[in-house]
């Protein structure tokens, strides 16, 4: 009797278990009692990444330079093109359909993790003993100057935005 379920990499149609098309190929015709499934390779600008019964291949993603995108990995018949962002930009989403400039860490914050093509700058507040007085996408919090090692004393305390100010020791007894 006709099957009601099929094996892996098969599909049921017209009471037949037909072979799925392999990745990189699209369905031309279903199998019959007397013939195999017929598949054709995707064209150069297309892909299918799974065993499938699709009658059309998917277009490779276009990495639009106007959106700050560039090709990270060229697509094949079995894989989509992977886009990344140009220098100084990162993706707005996991699918990387557009790019935005990396954010800078404001004074009082330092760079915890430098941005990549797919992730933004991660900032962290400068802890006690550290400061950042610039807006930067690269600079970490810097430690306060150690006045003691210069044989100086702290004249003005540091903050998360400013370094300490050192001065000479008072020579009066």
């Amino acid at each position: 009797e006709p099957p009601t379920a099929c094996r892996e990499k098969q599909y049921l149609i017209n009471s037949q278990c037909c072979s799925l098309c392999q990745p990189g190929q699209k369905l031309v015709s279903d199998c019959t009692e007397f013939t195999e499934t017929e598949c054709l390779p995707c064209s150069e600008s297309e892909f299918l990444d799974t065993w499938n019964r699709e009658t059309r291949c998917h277009q490779h993603k276009y990495c639009d330079p106007n959106l700050g995108l560039q090709v990270q990995q060229k697509g094949t018949s079995e894989t989509d093109t992977i886009c990344t962002c140009e220098e100084g930009l990162h993706c707005t989403s996991e699918s990387c359909e557009s790019c935005v400039p990396h954010r800078s860490c404001l004074p009082g914050f330092g760079v915890k993790q430098i941005a990549t093509g797919v992730s933004d700058t991660i900032c962290e507040p400068c802890p006690v003993g550290f400061f950042s007085n610039v807006s930067s996408a690269f600079e970490k919090c810097r430690p306060w100057t150690s006045c003691e090692t210069k044989d100086l004393v702290v004249q003005q305390a540091g903050t998360n935005k400013t370094d300490v100010v050192c001065g000479p020791q008072d020579r009066q007894r």
Partner: antibody, heavy 112, light 112 residues
């Protein structure tokens, strides 16, 4: 339901060309399947002659030595057989078939 | 070509008997996907063949369960588990894995 019906002359003279048409109803010949011609000489077994596929491409039995041509008219949902340079050995019942469905057959006699 | 040899060429049996017809191919009928396109047909005098079994062991719609097919590679069997009066006919195997498609020479099943 799928139905096939052969038509054509029942008598052909030696050296002439045998021409038969198969009219298909209940299924489009461009959808899928291979559309075959099969013959059976009197009192003998079945012989596959060739097919035309849903996409219009063909395959023929080499034993017929390039005498056979199968074509189609998609507007009429028909496919046709031409067999050239016939002899008495080509006298047979000719069937058109999708293999799961067959025409009832038409007898062709080659005689002068 | 894949030559198909059927045995026996004729067979006498009685209603209720279990009957086995074999078909042997000169080359394997299993294709690269692991599928085997071996079919069995029944033909009665003056009628077109009817599909019984496709892809070795699949009964075509409407075919009684007493008909079964088995085999692999080059050796195939059609079994009728309990002969009925309407089963007396000629049986053909047909391979459609390789072009040209080829039929066995037929097995005539007669009433004893």
């Amino acid at each position: 339901e799928v139905q096939l019906q052969e038509s054509g002359p029942g008598l052909v003279k030696p050296s002439e060309t045998l021409s038969l048409t198969c009219t298909v109803s209940g299924y489009s010949i461009t959808s899928n399947y291979y559309w075959n011609w099969i013959r059976q000489p009197p009192g003998k077994g079945l012989e596959w002659m060739g097919y035309i596929r849903y996409d219009g491409s063909n395959n023929y039995n080499p034993s017929l030595k390039n005498r056979v041509t199968i074509s189609r008219d998609t507007s009429k949902n028909q496919f046709s057989l031409k067999l050239s340079s016939v002899t008495a050995a080509d006298t047979a019942v000719y069937y058109c078939a999708r293999l799961d469905y067959w025409g009832q057959g038409t007898t062709v006699t080659v005689s002068s | 070509d894949a030559q198909m040899t059927q045995s026996p060429s004729s067979l006498s049996a009685s209603v209720g008997d279990r009957v086995t017809i074999t078909c042997r191919s000169s080359q394997s009928l299993e294709n690269t996907n692991g599928n085997t396109f071996l079919n069995w047909f029944q033909q009665k005098p003056g009628k077109a063949p009817k599909l019984l079994i496709y892809r070795v062991s699949n009964r075509f719609s409407g075919v009684p369960s007493r008909f079964s097919g088995s085999g692999s590679g080059t050796d195939f069997t059609l079994t009728i588990s309990s002969l009925q009066p309407e089963d007396f006919a000629t049986y053909y195997c047909l391979q459609v894995t390789h072009v040209p498609f080829t039929f066995g020479q037929g097995t005539k099943l007669e009433i004893k």
